[in-house]
């Protein structure tokens, strides 16, 4: 295999330090150059790479949405960590948005788990102890945590 540069690569910006690949791979925090000869550092706060790689670019940092708090910032080796604000949660099957936690359980059920950034409140039937599936009950059937306040819909 031969290599020919038709156009020289742009000189690396000061924050893009270069080093040599090891067995064709660059370490976390870097990506590889087109010709495979150099490892170029990711730009802090802009992009990152978590593993040894031979990719042409680093991955773009996640920006926390409104309704989320930033637990840790993006570094060259780790993406931003975002978490839903208090009173909201993100489900595995709908990770694109934080949803409001219900304020209470349906009639005949008791709360056994609090609202966390990862889960809604958990309700079980008083007698059987079986979990509630999570559908929002009709307002009139709701036993709320503070009297007179209807449960928030999961939207």
């Amino acid at each position: 295999i031969t290599q020919q540069d038709l156009a020289p690569q742009q000189r690396a910006a000061p924050q893009q330090k270069r080093s040599s690949p090891s067995e064709g791979l660059c370490p976390p925090g870097h990506h590889i150059s087109e010709d495979g000869r150099d490892c170029i550092s990711c730009k802090y706060g802009q992009d990152y790479s978590t593993h040894w790689n031979d990719l042409l670019f680093c991955l773009r940092c996640t920006r926390c949405d409104s309704g989320e708090v930033e637990l840790s910032p993006c570094t060259t080796t780790r993406n931003t960590v975002c978490q839903c604000e208090e009173g909201t949660f993100r489900e595995e099957d709908s990770p694109e948005m934080c949803r409001k936690c219900r304020t209470g359980c349906p009639r005949g059920m008791v709360k056994v788990g609090d609202c966390t950034p990862w889960s809604d409140i958990e309700c079980v039937h008083k007698e059987s102890g079986t979990k509630h599936s999570g559908e929002v009950p009709a307002v009139e059937e709701t036993v709320t945590s503070s009297p007179g306040t209807p449960a928030s819909p999961c939207s």
Epitope: D5, G24, D35, L56
Partner: nanobody, 123 residues
Framework: EVQLLESGGGEVQPGGSLRLSCAAS????????MGWFRQAPGKEREFLAV????????FYAESVKGRFTISRDNAKNTVYLQMSSLRAEDTAVYYC????????????????WGQGTLVTVSS
């Protein structure tokens, strides 16, 4: 969705020339390489050349260096393979492919492939 469409294949006499084109759509990567491969009946797919979008870096296989030239048109998102001094052994299906890896001269480094265009060199 990434789509690659090759064109320009056909029948040519030994010593003749042909230019293949590969039009790409759906590519949203910050940088990528577009490469050409070929596969003759009963043989493995063979790397020919690759050109990178940002820096224009090019790699060729020894078997085609000096006879084949790869080039690109950024505005059209198209890569070309100019083939000259064609021989009977150049008969194969020619494939265009996209990589997001550096120095990609191996088949496994390519993630997206076109359907291929047949080149027949025969007198």
């Amino acid at each position: 969705e990434v789509q690659l469409l090759e064109s320009g294949g056909g029948e040519v006499q030994p010593g003749g020339s042909l230019r293949l084109s590969c039009a790409a759509s759906g590519l949203t990567f910050p940088n990528y390489g577009m490469g050409w491969f070929r596969q003759a009946p009963g043989k493995e797919r063979e790397f020919l050349a690759v050109i990178y979008w940002s820096g224009g870096t090019v790699f060729y296989a020894e078997s085609v260096k000096g006879r084949f030239t790869i080039s690109r048109d950024n505005a059209k998102n198209t890569v070309y393979l100019q083939m000259s001094s064609l021989r009977a052994e150049d008969t194969a299906v020619y494939y265009c492919a996209v990589t997001i890896r550096g120095a990609a001269t191996q088949t496994w480094k390519y993630d997206y492939w076109g359907q291929g265009t047949l080149v027949t060199v025969s007198s």
